[in-house]
């Protein structure tokens, strides 16, 4: 079989949900010494980056200007060292937001509940969409989907203090084109002291894997680069629709 280099890691910088007309940045983390990186969109070549000097950095950033529905979809990347190409990265789903309208999010029985109570979120949007999405702040990869003509229900079942946090919803016009986000709804779940101490509130910063971890080379990094790259590929968690 033809020899290939380990697959790179593709990430969205800051977030994979990009407001229309704003810039998206995707990072492709490959290997020190890579002379070329290619970004592919829906299977076709989209952009090419040739870092100079190539041996000093283990990846590149691809800027995607003026985000719109035509540039939302599935991205992947590959890289080359000499004449040897890598395997293709996992797919990254890039979503355009702030399309058309803004939904309304509400919660029943209310935003303040007791641990064990059943809670349902309702997302309403009057324009033509049938898919709705609910996201918890700091957990933007864990998207819940629900369907409805104008309104969708998101039953949470009996909640625990782990459900505490801020929620937003979107209407979806297709898998990669979402509405403006709703205003956030903060769910407060009260429980006994033991439960509360075990379930701190979620961080409000972006998901930790939505960060570009490109590094400049040092002697030690060079020695560890291949081992580290293989390990990261093995452990990397990736979101799929």
């Amino acid at each position: 079989p033809k020899q290939t280099l380990p697959k790179p890691i593709i990430r969205a910088e800051s977030t994979y949900m990009v407001p229309k007309e704003k810039q998206a940045t995707l990072c492709c983390q490959g290997s020190y010494g890579a002379v070329e990186y290619q970004l592919h969109f829906e299977g076709s070549l989209f952009a090419v980056e040739r870092p100079k000097p190539p041996e000093r950095i283990n990846g590149v950033k691809f800027h995607i200007p003026d985000m719109n529905s035509r540039k939302a979809g599935r991205y992947s990347c590959i890289y080359r060292v000499g004449e040897l190409w890598s395997e293709r990265s996992d797919l990254l789903d890039l979503v355009v937001t702030e399309m058309y309208d803004t939904p309304t999010l509400s919660v029943h029985p209310g935003p303040e509940v007791t641990s064990g109570e059943k809670v349902t979120f309702y997302c309403r949007l009057d324009t033509a969409t049938s898919m709705f999405l609910l996201l918890k702040e700091g957990r933007s990869r864990d998207v819940q989907r629900s369907y409805g003509k104008v309104q969708a229900e998101f039953p949470m079942g009996p909640v625990t203090t782990a459900h505490r946090g801020s929620y937003r919803c979107f209407g979806s016009y297709n898998n990669y084109a979402w509405s403006f986000p709703s205003e956030p709804v903060k769910l407060l779940v009260t429980g006994d002291i033991e439960n509360t101490s075990l379930a701190p509130t979620d961080p409000t910063f972006p998901d930790s894997w939505d960060t570009c971890l490109l590094t400049r080379e040092t002697g030690l990094q060079k020695d560890l680069a291949l081992w580290d790259h293989t390990a990261q590929n093995h452990h990397h968690h990736h979101h799929h629709h």
């Epitope: 810039q23 969109f41 989209f46 952009a47 800027h63 995607i64 200007p65 540039k71």
Partner: nanobody, 130 residues
Framework: QVQLVESGGGLVQAGGSLRLLCAAS????????MAWFRQGPGKDREFVAA????????YYADSMKGRFTISRDNAKNTAYLQMNSLRLEDTAVYYC???????????????????????WGQGTQVTVSS
Amino acid sequence: QVQLVESGGGLVQAGGSLRLLCAASGRTFSRLPMAWFRQGPGKDREFVAAISWSGGSTYYADSMKGRFTISRDNAKNTAYLQMNSLRLEDTAVYYCAAVGDSAPYSATIVYTDARAYAYWGQGTQVTVSS
């Protein structure tokens, strides 16, 4: 806002050469990656060549490699496409395009997908005859 105007097209015999020019107005052109695309009769638009804003990085479609050369002169706000060894199948309208000026671009990035480009010229006709 960037306006692009192509020139230099015309009728040429197979095996001949042409040099296309893309004149840009707008202060940001010198910081924008750009490219040439073409659309032949009854065909889809296809990528020809791309160049980074610095001119330090170029990329070509396989069928143009070795025959076409893309370059730019940022001081003159102009990009060029030198086309040699022209073939009948090179007959097309040639368009230059520049990406949107919403981002600071790496000096070595090029874009090969038409969807990356915000600004387009009106095109110049190249006809290759036998």
